[in-house]
């Protein structure tokens, strides 16, 4: 059997670090057998069989000019094998970050903090850490590790499904190459990394007869679980065209009636979402939707929601079309505490 341990990587390739001494091993001989070494395609002898180094070739302070293919021959001139030298660096700890768009799953992404120049793979796993006792800061032996399944096609991402919202997890991402391994451990809790996707289906409509009103409505992001144990709260911003500053309100539910719009001007509206108990951070803003308040006077009778909905002054603008998801809408009493006359209409 070969005296050369096979490093992880393609067969026939051996590895070293620039600036360091490198030993190449002749694969087709018995350990200690004296061999001669040549560069492939060059007749010049690099190291003879009388070197005392047996089946190994030593290159002091290797540099890029030493990379390439080497040939070793036994005393009788038989081919002992060919070896390709590739230089690079041991792994450095990767940089890892984790994020969650809902309270049941999270993903972690990583990047090398230094390129090694060598074939590299990543091992990803996680443990669940549990606290012993409500008042205790001691941690029980963690459970796991379990693999953190990586995305196919080599994307630097792995996903933990079915995570527990109140638990802490320790993520292990280990960068491995033929010269070694280096591990980054990252402690994460779903509560701190939760960042919902932005709300979807944002529509901005005029309220006929109310020249200073706009009605905005939206739905939960599709990534939020269909039967949510945790609700989202929302933040809405609006501003007239050409106006630099946003006005901000926190709606009670999935719609908001803006009562101080500037008559006759188009308004940009955007919404953001966050866990209703303030876990994690606000989502990014949704794409902006636009609407212009209606012109004209207040009608004698307040039209019903259906009528309003079918005759908006401005065609509703939908940036991210999404079907309505009534199962995601909390009870109407959670949505609105305003007088129905002031609001003109409530959610169906």
């Amino acid at each position: 059997s070969s005296p050369c341990p096979q490093a992880w990587g393609p067969p026939g390739v051996q590895y070293g670090q620039p600036g360091r001494s490198v030993k190449l091993c002749c694969p087709g001989v018995t350990a200690g057998d004296p061999v001669s070494w040549f560069r492939d395609g060059e007749p010049k002898l690099l190291q003879g069989p009388d070197s005392g180094l047996g089946h190994e070739l030593v290159l002091a302070q290797a540099d890029s000019t030493d990379e390439g293919t080497y040939i070793c021959q036994t005393l009788d001139g038989a081919l002992g094998g060919t070896v390709t030298l590739q230089l690079g660096y041991p792994p450095a700890r990767p940089v890892v970050s984790c994020q969650a768009a809902d309270y049941e799953n999270f993903s972690c992404t990583w990047s090398p903090s230094q390129i090694s120049g060598l074939p590299t793979r990543y091992l990803t796993s996680y443990r669940k850490k549990t606290v012993l006792g409500a008042d205790s800061q001691r941690r029980s032996p963690s459970t796991g590790p379990w693999p953190c399944p990586q995305d196919p096609l080599g994307a630097a991402r792995c996903v933990v499904h079915g995570a527990e919202f109140w638990s802490q997890y320790r993520i292990n991402v280990t960068e491995v190459n033929p010269l070694g391994a280096s591990t980054r451990l990252l402690d994460v809790s779903l509560q701190s990394i939760l960042r919902p996707d932005p709300p979807q289906g944002l529509r901005v409509e005029s309220v006929p007869g109310y020249p200073r009103r706009l009605r905005a409505s939206w739905t939960y992001p599709a990534s939020w679980p269909c039967q949510p144990h945790f609700l989202l709260k929302f933040r809405l911003q609006y501003r007239p065209a050409q106006h630099p500053a946003w006005s901000t309100v926190e709606p009670a539910g999935l719609e908001e009636v803006i009562t101080d719009a500037v008559a006759g001007l188009p308004h940009a509206v955007r919404v953001s979402a966050r866990d209703f108990l303030d876990a994690g951070t606000w989502s990014t803003w949704s794409p902006e939707a636009w609407g212009t308040p209606s012109t004209g006077t207040i009608p004698k009778e307040i039209p019903a929601w259906g009528q309003l909905h079918t005759q908006p002054e401005v065609e509703p603008q939908v940036d991210s079309p999404a079907p309505p998801r009534p199962s995601l809408q909390p009870h109407p009493r959670l949505l609105d505490h305003r007088d129905s006359v002031e609001q003109v209409a409530v959610l169906a």
Partner: antibody, heavy 118, light 107 residues
Amino acid sequence: EVQLLESGGGLVQPGGSLRLSCAASGFTFSWYSMTWVRQAPGKGLEWVSSIVPSGGHTQYADSVKGRFTISRDNSKNTLYLQMNSLRAEDTAVYYCAKGPGWGQFAVWGRGTLVTVSS
Amino acid sequence: DIQMTQSPSSLSASVGDRVTITCQASQDINNYLNWYQQKPGKAPKLLIYDASNLQTGVPSRFSGSGSGTDFTFTISSLQPEDIATYYCQQYDNLSPTFGPGTKVDIK
């Protein structure tokens, strides 16, 4: 010889913006994480921001988060720091530093002075 | 963030003296600690990495030790050119932090 050369510093009013550059030479720039570290006059060193070789991960000190943006152009061997909404407390010499890995600063530039004052 | 403390904040010693600086982390940082030297008007220079490894080209009178939360930096025989401020720095997590520095001068 490995070299880092910062530029772009100067006097700016509070609320203003500056973009610092760091030109790298003598090594394979695209292989290394890069960092900005600053030092206020007569004070200690403060890490500002770091970026991985691909640019895919960045990290910022709380004191600059949301105001500063680190970026890199590997084709130009250059690191950048875009500084917006500058405050008097951002006055410092800004150093560019090279890895090996993340958080190790084996090579430093000479620094560029940023003064925020009205 | 991980806080780093250094002591003493300054010291005076004679040429040839053994000088010791300590650095303490607010939590376990394994051996992810570097030591830097900064001379007046100059950029910092890495002396010790991973708590105890001497950076290439740095004189052997400089050494470091420690792991976890407590670390020590030693100059075995102080030389006039060692007048500088010395900083420890952790990189256990993704937000590196420096100690406040120790100013070393000659008596």
